[in-house]
Interface confidence: medium
């Protein structure tokens, strides 16, 4: 009976990249007044939690708390809403949310091939590298929800590197990169030192904030 109602939204507070041992709250919400929310982690068939939905200002929501982040709890999460007591009549699933544990390995280096200050319209390429044998690099930009990822190239001069072509520069931003291994896609290294890319001739480096319902009310259900 899946998909009777439209999908809820699933968010992570303060974010989906979580340091080892730290806390993250997964918030499932909808403008449908769901009585219950179910949180499911992919690949763990019995790993589904159920919470009573809280209703406030035309929104129903539930907060699932991971109180101590470990590798076991990293992975792809989805949530569902239910308007009846039957657990089998649930909404369509939320969009998947990848929760990643970071800080397990040493930080890679991040640099801009033409330097951190570029002219508007100039092509920008950021290079992430490490002597550690990372298979994959992930590049994040402050204010953006999703990371770019690229496989590390073969070892050259003792380092494994990936070059991220960002295209013509329009806005500056703060970038970070992480390394990971193909066998553990949800386990990343420590963050590189942040790299501030400035675009000359560009008056604004502001970023829009995504609109999200408040997560300050309600008692979260603990996962661990």
């Amino acid at each position: 009976h899946e998909g009777v109602h439209r999908k809820p939204s699933l968010l992570a507070h303060p974010g989906r990249l979580v340091k080892s041992e730290e806390t993250v709250i997964l918030q499932c919400w909808s403008d449908v007044m769901f009585e219950h929310f179910l949180l499911h982690r992919e690949g763990m068939f019995n790993d589904t939690l159920r919470l009573i939905g809280e209703h406030h200002d035309g929104v129903s929501k539930a907060n699932f708390s991971i109180s101590r982040m470990t590798q076991d709890l990293a992975g792809t999460y989805r949530c569902y809403g239910s308007v009846t007591h039957s657990p089998y009549q649930v909404s369509a699933p939320s969009d998947p949310l990848d929760i990643v544990i970071i800080g397990l390995y040493e930080k890679p280096s991040l640099s801009a091939q033409l330097g951190p200050t570029v002219l508007a319209g100039e092509n920008v390429t950021l290079s992430c590298s490490s002597r550690s044998s990372y298979d994959m690099y992930h590049l994040s930009r402050e204010g953006e929800a999703h990371e770019r990822r690229l496989p590390a190239g073969p070892k050259v001069n003792g380092t494994f590197q990936a070059d991220f072509p960002l295209g013509p520069a329009t806005h500056g931003g703060t970038y970070r990169c992480f390394g990971s291994f193909h066998d553990s896609p949800y386990e990343w290294s420590k963050s590189s030192d942040p790299l501030l890319v400035s675009v000359t001739g560009n008056p604004s480096n502001s970023w829009p904030s995504p609109t999200e319902p408040s997560s300050k009310t309600g008692n979260p259900r603990h996962l661990h």
């Epitope: 590798q71 076991d72 397990l104 390995y105 040493e106 002597r131 550690s132 044998s133 003792g158 990971s180 291994f181 193909h182 066998d183 553990s184 386990e187």
Partner: antibody, heavy 123, light 110 residues
């Protein structure tokens, strides 16, 4: 509580074979890389082999490459090491150890150890 | 690849501080922050004391600390106690994506 229990050691002739097992409990076995480390009598520690949490990646010390094979059965929470072409210098206590993460490349460390099983290669 | 170099033995009196060194190359100790230290009592399995150069696992006394300078890592034990008497091994990641141990250091508490 994390527990690792090795078994399968014993006396074997040069050129012979053995299979060591390590039964794990107290943690989500498939979430962690596992390792074998050995210690010859009166000598220091030597890393032997590593397998990632999924079993998809394996790593070996040069001294055992082509002779030893590491594997795991996540449904049984058990780690294995198949030893073939055994030599006198393979005589050692073999420890299984849990890694820090799933990946288990050389960046790993060993946060829990079993008590070891003794392999003696002698004619 | 040869083992990392550790002194064969060190000693100290109760209450004193001792330091055990672990010397490698730029391809192992010097090149990465993946140095670990293990304590092994006679007839027992090793126990992790320090990881990633200077981090202590839960349950390990804060009398144990780790550091690194260039190609040499160090384990310092302060306020030496009788139960610290054991063998200590360092280990490091290497550029060939393997793990290498030191030869071990026997700590004697006088």
């Amino acid at each position: 509580e994390v527990q690792l229990l090795e078994s399968g050691g014993g006396l074997v002739q040069p050129g012979g074979s053995l299979r060591l097992s390590c039964a794990a409990s107290g943690f989500t076995f498939s979430s962690y890389a596992m390792h074998w480390v050995r210690q010859a009598p009166g000598k220091g520690l030597e890393w032997v082999s590593t397998i990632s949490g999924s079993g998809g990646s394996t790593y070996y010390a040069d001294s055992v490459k082509g002779r030893f094979a590491i594997s795991r059965d996540n449904s049984k929470s058990t780690l294995y090491l198949r030893l073939t072409g055994l030599r006198a210098e393979d005589t050692a206590v073999y420890y299984c150890a849990k890694g820090r993460s799933r990946a288990g490349a050389g960046e790993d460390y060993f946060d829990f150890w079993g008590q070891g099983t003794l392999v003696t290669v002698s004619s | 690849q040869s083992a990392l170099t550790q002194p064969a033995s060190v000693s100290g009196s109760p209450g004193q501080s001792i330091t055990i060194s672990c010397t490698g190359t730029s391809s192992d100790v010097g090149g990465y922050n993946y140095v670990s230290w293990y304590q092994q009592h006679p007839g027992k399995a090793p126990k992790l004391m320090i990881y990633d150069v200077s981090n202590r696992p839960p349950g390990v006394s804060n009398r144990f600390s780790g550091s690194k300078s260039d190609n040499t890592a160090s384990l310092t034990i302060s306020g030496l106690q009788d139960e610290d008497e054991a063998d200590y091994y360092c280990s490091s990641y290497t550029s060939s994506n393997t793990i290498i141990f030191g030869g071990g250091t026997k700590l004697t508490v006088l």
